[in-house]
Structure formats: C-alpha cells, structure tokens
Interface confidence: medium
C-alpha cells in the first residue's frame, strides 16, 4: 500500500571491504548505515519534517506532475560512528566520524 | 549526456494562485522558487557538497544498484523570501518567511 | 557600506518610456527587497512598486501595464521601466531598501516630464 | 481601497510636544501596522517608527507611535520638540490591493 511506501529509514549495512573503503579504515569492518527509501506524496507527514519548500513543491507536483519533481525522502539527521584508520601510515582512533549513520529522515 | 542531467537547480515559478495559498498571502503574487533536479551519481562532485554517507550510498548503487538506492539531488541551502500575509485578519509584513526559495542543492 | 543610487534622465518627452537604473551596494538583492517611491514636485510619496527578494514583483495597480520593473542581481541593479509618460509623471524617483522597514533611500532622481 | 488621511501643516514650539494623525478612511486601522517617515526639504525620507511603535537604530526616543482605534487614527508623538524635528512626515500603511499606501504627508513647522 501507498503508507508502506512512504518515506522511512531502512536497512542498509556497509561493508567497508565491498566499497574499498578497508584499504584505510581498520576497524570496524562494516556497520549499519540505513537509507531513507520511499515516497513524498502530499500531504506531507509531520513526522518528515518537510521544509516549506517541500510542501509547496509536493503541492505542485500534485496538480501538475510535469510542472515539478516530488520532494525526495533524504536523511535529516545523521550520526557519527567510531572508526580506526590509517593516518599516514598510522593507525588512529576517531571517536565521531560524522555523517556515517542515517538517525531520521525527511521530505526535502 | 550525464553532466547535463547531473544534480542542479532548475527553474520552479509557484504562483500562490495555483496552490490555493493567495488567500492568506497577499503579496507577492508568487515567486522563484526553484527546485533541484538530476542524478546524484558517484563520484559526487565536491560543489553538491555530499554528506559522507551519500558518498558511501552513491558508491554501494554504483557497485550494486539492488541494495541501495541512489543518493537524492535536493536542496541543501534555503532562502526566506518577504510577504505580505494575513493573520486572524490582520494584513502582516514578515521580512524573512523562511524557507521558502532552493538556494543550492546537492546530493543526500 | 549600504548605498542605493538611482540613474537616468532628467528630462522625457511625453509619451516616450522612462528607464532608470538603481545601482546597489552593501547587500544583496537576494536578501533585502528594493522599493521604487516616487514624490511630484511639493506633493506626497507614491509607492510604485517593490522587487521582492525572492524575485517576485508587486505594483501598484495606478500604473495598470505601463510599469516593468525588473533586476540584474549579478549586477546589483534595479530598474524601472515606464511608457506614456505623462506631465503629470514629472517627480522624484526614488528606489529604497526594505529589509524589517525602509532603512536605506537613494538620493532621488528629478525627472521632468515636457516637450 | 482605503486612503490615509493627514492634516496638510501644523505648527509647533520648541520644547513643545506635538501629535501628528494618520486617519484610515475605511477599515480598522489596526489591521496593519502603520509606518512614519520623516523627510526634511530636499532629502529622502528615513523611517522614524516602524510596526506602530518600534524606533529604528538612532532614532531619539523623543518619537513614539502609537494606535487609536476610537478615532481609526495613528498617531506619531513628537516630546521636546527640537527645531530640527521641522520636517513633512509621512504615515505609511498596507492595504491588500494597493499593498503599500502613503498618507498625504503633514508639514511640521517649529516656530
């Protein structure tokens, strides 16, 4: 149905030997990403958080699909993870490596 | 070709007629709103200043396009414009209606 | 620091077009909107019309069509475009800034309008 | 479509206070804020009170606006009048149609 299609966080785990990303981070060797997936139709939930740019446009798109895109369902808030990497050629320790992690996501 | 259908900021004129908002926004009658459009595929360029998790996302679709969507091409910067607006009946001057006009956009 | 300046002609024939510029400095007309007020020789303002920030425009209906007005933002500039010009249109034209209220006006350019 | 009505002069001592009117013809005055302008001969006006009763930076706080809703009138009040206050002031307002409208101006004279 068109609610289970919604705009929400999903599952999406990283490998970071699949994306080449173990040639420098050590530790740890994948982790839980998430994706926001699904639709921004109009109305626009609250929980979405949809700037008013993104309601006008879903407005839009509603009347007159060719006039503009849907507003897109994209990470709001994001979370950092702790990772070990190399630092010429030096391992170290990064506490928060921002913007790794979807927390929310959104209608923008 | 593909740098031509790359993530930007395209024309969107919203007419506050045609979305029903002209009555409690009295002026202006509408305004560049713009929208962002196009494909955010990897790699993705440093002025659509991507978080890293669409970096990693973008790079997981190139790789394997079933387990992760691609990034999103959405407003990343936006700009208040002035209107003139009515509130319990009361004709109201808000300088900075925020959120309104896509200023930049990039992939998320 | 903030300046608007207002260029154009002194003197139009009536029924030629009126074309002036007002040449901004000191912010953006992306962030602040630009009014156009114009003031007859001893008499009162008129509003004319406003360049909205976000690029809509709004005019007074008193100049039915025969009014553009229109912006070169990468050039900082506002202008101001009217036909069938009139006696009666000769005036002060200012352009001013509004932001929360009116803050900045340029100096003003007397236009007469005779033959 | 409203017009603002202002007495055309008025006249004034140093020292003195004074009350210059802004009457809304039709339509309640309080429905938009109103705006005073003060221009001295040869220059261009600058804003003295804006939303009804907010002085802008440098504004001396001899100027106040305020709201009579029995008289549908605004009112800019001018304490200690200084010869410097001789000027034409301008009431400004919005309508909905028009969208920004002026009254006829009052010249203050400082005797």
């Known amino acids: 149905n068109a609610k289970g299609n919604y705009c929400k966080r999903t599952p999406l785990y990283i490998d970071f030997k699949e994306i080449g990303w173990d040639s420098w981070i050590i530790a740890p060797p994948g982790y839980e990403a998430y994706e926001c997936r699904g639709v921004c139709n109009y109305p626009l939930a609250e929980h979405l958080t949809p700037t008013k740019h993104a309601i006008i446009q879903a407005l839009v798109h509603l009347k007159n699909s060719q006039k503009a895109s849907k507003a897109c369902c994209v990470p709001t808030k994001l979370e950092p993870i702790s990772i070990l990497y190399l630092d010429k050629g030096v391992v170290t320790y990064k506490f928060k490596y921002e913007g790794m992690a979807v927390s929310e996501c959104g209608c923008r | 070709n593909a740098k031509g259908n790359y993530c930007k900021r395209t024309p969107l004129y919203i007419d506050f007629k045609e979305i029903g908002w002209d009555s409690w926004i009295i002026a202006p009658p509408g305004y560049e709103a713009y929208e962002c459009r196009g494909v955010c595929n990897y790699p993705l360029a440093e002025h659509l200043t991507p978080t890293k998790h669409a970096i990693i996302q973008a790079l997981v679709h190139l790789k394997n396009s079933q387990k992760a969507s691609k990034a999103c091409c959405v407003p990343t910067k936006l700009e208040p414009i002035s209107i003139l607006y009515l509130d319990k009946g009361v004709v109201t001057y808000k300088f900075k209606y925020e959120g309104m006009a896509v200023s930049e956009c990039g992939c998320r | 620091q903030v300046q608007l300046q207002e260029s154009g002609p002194d003197l139009v024939q009536p029924s030629q077009t009126l074309d002036i510029t007002c040449t901004v400095s000191g912010f953006s007309l992306t962030t602040y909107n630009v009014h156009w007020v114009r003031q007859p020789p001893g008499k009162g303002l008129e509003w004319m019309g406003t360049?909205?920030?976000?690029?809509?425009?709004d005019y007074n209906s008193a100049f039915k069509s025969r009014l553009a007005i229109s912006r070169d933002t990468s050039k900082n500039e506002v202008f101001l475009k009217m036909d069938s010009l009139q006696t009666d249109d000769t005036a002060k034209y200012f352009c001013a800034r509004l932001g929360y209220y009116v803050d900045y006006w340029g100096q003003g350019i007397l236009v007469t309008v005779s033959s | 479509q409203f017009v603002l009505i202002q007495s055309d002069s008025m006249s004034t001592s140093a020292g003195s206070t004074v009350k210059l009117s802004c009457k809304r013809s039709?339509?309640?005055?309080?429905?938009?804020?109103v705006y005073w302008y003060q221009q001295h001969e040869g220059r261009s006006p600058t804003t003295m009170i804006y939303d009804g009763d907010k002085r802008p930076d440098g504004v001396p706080d001899r100027f106040s606006g305020s709201i009579d809703s029995s008289s549908n009138s605004a009112s800019l009040t001018i304490n200690n009048v200084q010869i410097e206050d001789e000027a034409v002031y301008f009431c400004q307002s919005f309508s909905s149609g028009i969208k920004f409208i002026f009254g006829g101006g009052t010249k203050l004279t400082v005797l």
């Open positions: 039709t339509g309640n005055i309080g429905s938009s804020y």
């Open positions: 360049m909205w920030n976000g690029g809509g425009i």
